[in-house]
């Protein structure tokens, strides 16, 4: 199956690659903007420059290009522990990450928010954090792993998920009959 | 098992207000981050909010910032949602899901989820 192509794919295609075709005449192709800049104004004609302006401190355009405007920097999302790890430039947009011994969490495929890395206290490390996750613990006997922490077994009740986890310490813990609330 | 039942969906005017609550059953509700999903008539699953489990830390997506409010009862097992201010593209079935952090994004364990539907 063909792909079906925007009007703008259609104009492109049909002009060699690093040009366009001119909005108003077809048979004319004018040279792409270098990332970094971009078109102020279309090439008068065939074998003439096309007209390309510096993006401004705040914008940038990260490849070749025939747009009207640059496209905004983003800013990183200090709420949700983000910092910037380098600057936006004419031709590359801000890089936002996350600080030392933390990992990201995407909540969308373009917003994340940065956690601690998990520690495993009473536990050793099975897989160290990485950007994109937490650590993996293996907990010591006596100690359950909930939510990627190392639990003492006296904090776990009958019927709860980490039963299986705690055997046979479970016998020896009291409250066994609750509702699994803690 | 792990259960979650929601409720409180229905038909609201676009400004109206709804609260919507997840019941939760077969897990240690506090230990979790939990929140609320949705997805609107043919498109994508997506994270409106999420709370801890304390309660202290939450996330909400740009679009419903400062019109949806996140909460639990971790006494009751219970998740809820204030939903005020609604607009036409709020209407999905949302669904209560748990969080699991790390990557994603993904949605976890999910509830079978209750209609929202906005018009006038």
């Known amino acids: 199956l063909v792909p079906h192509l925007g009007d703008r794919e259609k104009r492109d295609s049909v002009c060699p690659q690093g040009k366009y075709i001119h909005p108003q005449n077809n048979s004319i192709c004018c040279t792409k903007c270098h990332k970094g800049t971009y078109l102020y104004n279309d090439c008068p004609g065939p074998g003439q420059d096309t007209d390309c302006r510096e993006c401004e401190s705040g914008s940038f355009t990260a490849s070749e290009n025939h747009l009207r405007h640059c496209l905004s920097c983003s800013k990183c999302r200090k709420e949700m522990g983000q910092v910037e790890i380098s600057s936006c430039t004419v031709d590359r947009d801000t890089v936002c990450g996350c600080r030392k011994n933390q990992y990201r969490h995407y909540w969308s495929e373009n917003l994340f928010q940065c956690f601690n890395c998990s520690l495993c206290l009473n536990g050793t490390v099975h897989l160290s954090c990485q950007e994109k996750q937490n650590t993996v613990c293996t907990c010591h006997a006596g100690f359950f792993l909930r939510e990627n922490e190392c639990v003492s077994c006296s904090n776990c009740k009958k019927s709860l998920e980490c039963t299986k986890l705690c055997l046979p310490q479970i016998e020896n813990v009291k409250g066994t009959e609750d509702s699994g609330t803690t | 098992e792990v259960q979650l039942l929601e409720s409180g969906g229905g038909l609201v005017q676009p400004g109206g207000s709804l609260r919507l609550s997840c019941a939760v059953s077969?897990?240690?509700?506090?230990?979790?981050?939990m929140g609320w999903v949705r997805q609107a008539p043919g498109k994508g699953l997506e994270w409106v909010s999420a709370i801890s489990g304390s309660g202290g830390s939450t996330y909400y997506a740009d679009s419903v910032k400062g019109r949806f409010t996140i909460s639990r009862d971790n006494s009751k097992n219970t998740l809820y949602l204030q939903m005020n201010s609604l607009r036409a593209e709020d209407a999905a079935v949302y669904y209560c899901a748990k969080v699991k952090l790390g990557g994603g994004p993904n949605f976890g364990y999910r509830g079978q989820g209750t209609l929202v539907t906005v018009s006038s």
């Open positions: 077969g897990l240690t509700f506090e230990w979790y981050w």
